[in-house]
Amino acid sequence: LIQERRSHQNNPAAHLTGANSSLTGSGGPLLWETQLGLAFLRGLDYHDGALVANKAGYYYIYSKVQLGGVGCPLGLASTITHGLYKRTPRYPEELELLVSQQSPCGRATSNSRVWWDSSFLGGVVHLEVGEEVVVRVLDERLVRLRDGTRSYFGAFMV
Amino acid sequence: LIQERRSHQNNPAAHLTGANSSLTGSGGPLLWETQLGLAFLRGLDYHDGALVANKAGYYYIYSKVQLGGVGCPLGLASTITHGLYKRTPRYPEELELLVSQQSPCGRATSNSRVWWDSSFLGGVVHLEVGEEVVVRVLDERLVRLRDGTRSYFGAFMV
Amino acid sequence: LIQERRSHQNNPAAHLTGANSSLTGSGGPLLWETQLGLAFLRGLDYHDGALVANKAGYYYIYSKVQLGGVGCPLGLASTITHGLYKRTPRYPEELELLVSQQSPCGRATSNSRVWWDSSFLGGVVHLEVGEEVVVRVLDERLVRLRDGTRSYFGAFMV
């Protein structure tokens, strides 16, 4: 039982939450709260929006983003892409891990209609020590932040 | 290997399923089947809709609800809120953990159109012994139950 | 620590990815890439679209499918069903485990409008040795495959 408890206490896990500073508008990944509220890091590090692996292995990574808007810009059902991406020293470009595309504002049948949608991603990926995972949303202007419960990003070793 | 198997057998986990009695209409949380069919409890308790932690630690908690209806009431794209909430004796009001807002019936462009949508939530949260997690849906009248496979609620320690 | 690492290295886990060959049109389950790219099998087997348990226990199983299309066939908001199903020698028919129904193309208000939607399922189920889990989508013609990041299927023991 001591062994089992120790195993859980050491198992890498993290849950990061959305904050007003999450959306940078700079074309970079979303940034996250790592310590206060519901957020925590256990055996994983954080750097500029990225969860960083301290231990090699398979991780279940997940992210949810809350989307919302009023009507459809230019009457178009714009496509929103929400994805989890890996950064690794061996490759200069980020690698797509898990991605979703949605056309949520097509739900609003007039330009003044408020709409909400949510996108959830989760899956198991392998991370080496030092490899990073980030969340990107295109177009991030449609991400609706409030209090850390609607948009978030996490992982745990499996 | 014996150690490893024992560890898994003792790891708290649960999966609860929707049933006709899930929707109470009382303003309370959804209620769940805990034993029949796909439902089970292992190292977690259940009380009035809530999963109750018997062991302190970080848990991946999740819920899915199946939504559906015919047309949009009053032609409005009503917002549905699906959330996981924590109850703890010190704080009588539930604490939001993971929440989604959706406007699914905006998908139906006429009042006679049948629509379906699904909302999934999952994330890692900390629970102390005796703390409870419940699921709420507003408006719960749009939750469509059938056989325990479309709406459910679960957790496991990570 | 050795014990803890061994436990993780042996813990059954898998992540399978969508490929051009995933959609058979034969009425069978989706097929998956098991080795290339992001796909892997660790302590689970694969057979004709199915993840096969080598070790009895509770597994968190998950699947995401990327849906997309142009307009709504016949102007109808067609219902898409995405589900995880269990095959077991004891029963001739597949058992529903986790299922979602969605009406995504209702988002497009004209017949020429492109729409995208995503469906995610995840939950804990019990598998005996030799039992299989498959993914089905009806109508699978609306599944949009690309590079293994948008439609996938996985599991790990909890």
Epitope: E33, Q35, L41 | H126 | -
Partner: antibody
Amino acid sequence: QVQLVQSGAEVKKPGASVKVSCRASGYTFTSYLMHWVRQAPGQRLEWMGWINVGNGNTKYSQKFQGRVTITRDTSASTAYMELSGLRSEDTAVYYCARNYYNWFDPWGQGTLVTVSS
Amino acid sequence: QSALTQPASVSGSPGQSITISCTGTSSDVGGYNYVSWYQQHPGKAPKLMIYDVSKRPSGVSNRFSGSKSGNTASLTISGLQAEDEADYYCFSYAGSSTVVFGGGTKLTVL
């Protein structure tokens, strides 16, 4: 129940250091941040910093940066706040407080530190 | 991080209602529903009275209520009693793992 018990009052000379302890009970010590807040006589509450008890990460108020060090001993469920280079204006009651979500609850009973030559 | 702005003092007679304001910015009070209020009697540790803008912990009288509008949060105490005389502090999450206290308000029950 959840409780924080702090060490007793201290009298220090200017230039010295003081280390105040805060022993936690009734909850999982490693799963919450611990904050330190001080209050000089007749003055307002002043946030000094926090420690993530689980991983040891710290964040300090700019005002105290370089003079304050917050540590913890997980085996003893105890957090510590050490303030160096003491001056007379550091005379205050020092409180530890558990971070629960986005508020402080509970608080320790306080430790009076008097800096006097 | 500059302190949230509170009035230095407020007063009221027993049975009356009083309101204490707490003004911040869109980066703290206005940006999140994460305002809490603490009561501190002389020589005692602060006590949580309100969390998440308007919620009361168990054991706190329902005479205490909280609200928020824009960048200003408010604590209202109805049916003032002698034992309510104390200092009151607001507190807010301010993003990026930072927090900020108010300057404190001394409540006098006349």
